[in-house]
Amino acid sequence: MAVTACQGLGFVVSLIGIAGIIAATCMDQWSTQDLYNNPVTAVFNYQGLWRSCVRESSGFTECRGYFTLLGLPAMLQAVRALMIVGIVLGAIGLLVSIFALKCIRIGSMEDSAKANMTLTSGIMFIVSGLCAIAGVSVFANMLVTNFWMSTANMYTGMGGMVQTVQTRYTFGAALFVGWVAGGLTLIGGVMMCIACRGLAPEETNYKAVSYHASGHSVAYKPGGFKASTGFGSNTKNKKIYDGGARTEDEVQSYPSKHDYV
């Protein structure tokens, strides 16, 4: 019951987180004009990952897309990539986790399969959350750097005569949405991983044992040639030269009738 609750809660938290990551990625307010020096501006600027906007005194907002790919800063491209990777991983994670939910029965899916799927989706959510947090943090760092650079040369004069206040940008709402959403996705992923441990079936205390003849039986073993040429049931293409000596894989495989003397 606790496992189902943990898994369900992990799924819901991750779902909210991924929805938040998508929302943050689409939002225009990644950076907003800092109003400290001009709190009464009639023209308000803000920028997103995909376009920049200007709200004018009339109340009209004009947005223009970044219609260039090569002309954009590498950091912005990196942030875009991180957010998209986060969304893609999160979406795949959601898809996997739906089938992994203990409360949903799909055919005769074993608990071990559900446990594996839960773990997979959990890891995907963790990576997705980290991607979002990283993306938002890189952008925030870029803003801080630019903010202090523009503060240093706040007034760029035309021949030292004219005062032109340089527009500075500060953290926009999207950054906070991104951080929170990334955190939620991360928490959801951790919860899924915890739930996976409870879903995994208990390991059996016995293993299949195979008995081998002490002599060099390689000449009499059918399939020996096939194994070496890759046509037999042993698709690992391990050549059998030494009688009785087995690779780890073969020791743990189910015994065949040829192993008994």
Epitope: V40, T41, V43, E56, S58, G59, T164, Q166, T167
Partner: antibody
């Protein structure tokens, strides 16, 4: 077409209040801020303030702060500008202005403050 | 507040003349966000409401004749009428549309010579 129709001329005594209305038509009223501008005889145009019809947010010229109140009735697509504690220097033509680039102006409302 | 200074305050010219009037702002009206100068020019005739001529310092409003042109950037702006027509005799105002309070110039009155 976009039109702003203002209320008629007003004659007020000093210390009184005046409320000018501005009815908008031909566009979505909540799309643009509504600004108010006045022009005293032979003087330059003077911005009073604006209101965002979406949320009722306002911004006023410090010169009129405390004396001016701009409101809207979105259901009637009408904006109002109320100026209190009137003085003789408030005698002017009051305009409402809207749309992008503040392109559309009302016909103006003459407010005369005289004892 | 941004101060807007227009010159000359009055100007006499004849039909067909090319006239130029200037407007200076105490602060830059340039917005780096969209690379626009937030200066607007209006024409006002006696007893009428002002009419928008030019926005963003140089963009003509639709329906405004091509003889009207605006130029300038930062703090210095110019309105030019290439060939004066009888209906152009009026008062012209420049306006700061960049910072509140929005402020207007004192106007340039264009009169018939």
């Amino acid at each position: 077409q976009v039109q702003l129709v203002q209320s008629g001329a007003e004659v007020k005594k000093p210390g009184a209040s005046v409320k000018v209305s501005c009815k908008a038509s031909g566009y979505t009223f909540t799309d643009y801020n509504m600004h108010w501008v006045r022009q005293a005889p032979g003087q330059r145009l003077e911005w009073i303030g604006y209101i965002n019809p979406n949320n009722g947010g306002t911004s006023y010229n410090q010169k009129f702060k405390g004396r001016v109140t701009i409101t809207v009735d979105t259901s009637a697509s009408t904006a109002y500008m109320e100026l209190s504690s009137l003085r003789s220097e408030d005698t002017a033509v009051y305009y409402c202005v809207t749309t992008r680039y503040l392109a559309v102006w009302g016909q103006g409302t003459t407010v005369t403050v005289s004892s | 507040d941004i101060q807007m200074t227009q010159s000359p305050s009055s100007l006499s010219a004849s039909v067909g003349d090319r006239v130029t009037m200037t407007c200076k702002s105490s602060q830059s009206l340039f917005n780096s966000g969209n690379q626009k100068n937030y200066l607007t020019w209006y024409q006002q005739k006696p007893g009428k409401a002002p009419k928008l001529l030019i926005y963003w310092a140089s963009t003509r409003e639709s329906g405004v004749p091509s003889r009207f042109s605006g130029s300038g950037s930062g703090t210095d702006f110019t309105l030019t009428i290439s060939s004066l027509q009888p209906e152009d005799f009026a008062t012209y105002y420049c306006q700061n549309d960049y910072s509140y309070p929005l402020t207007f110039g004192g106007g340039t009155k264009l009169e018939i010579k």
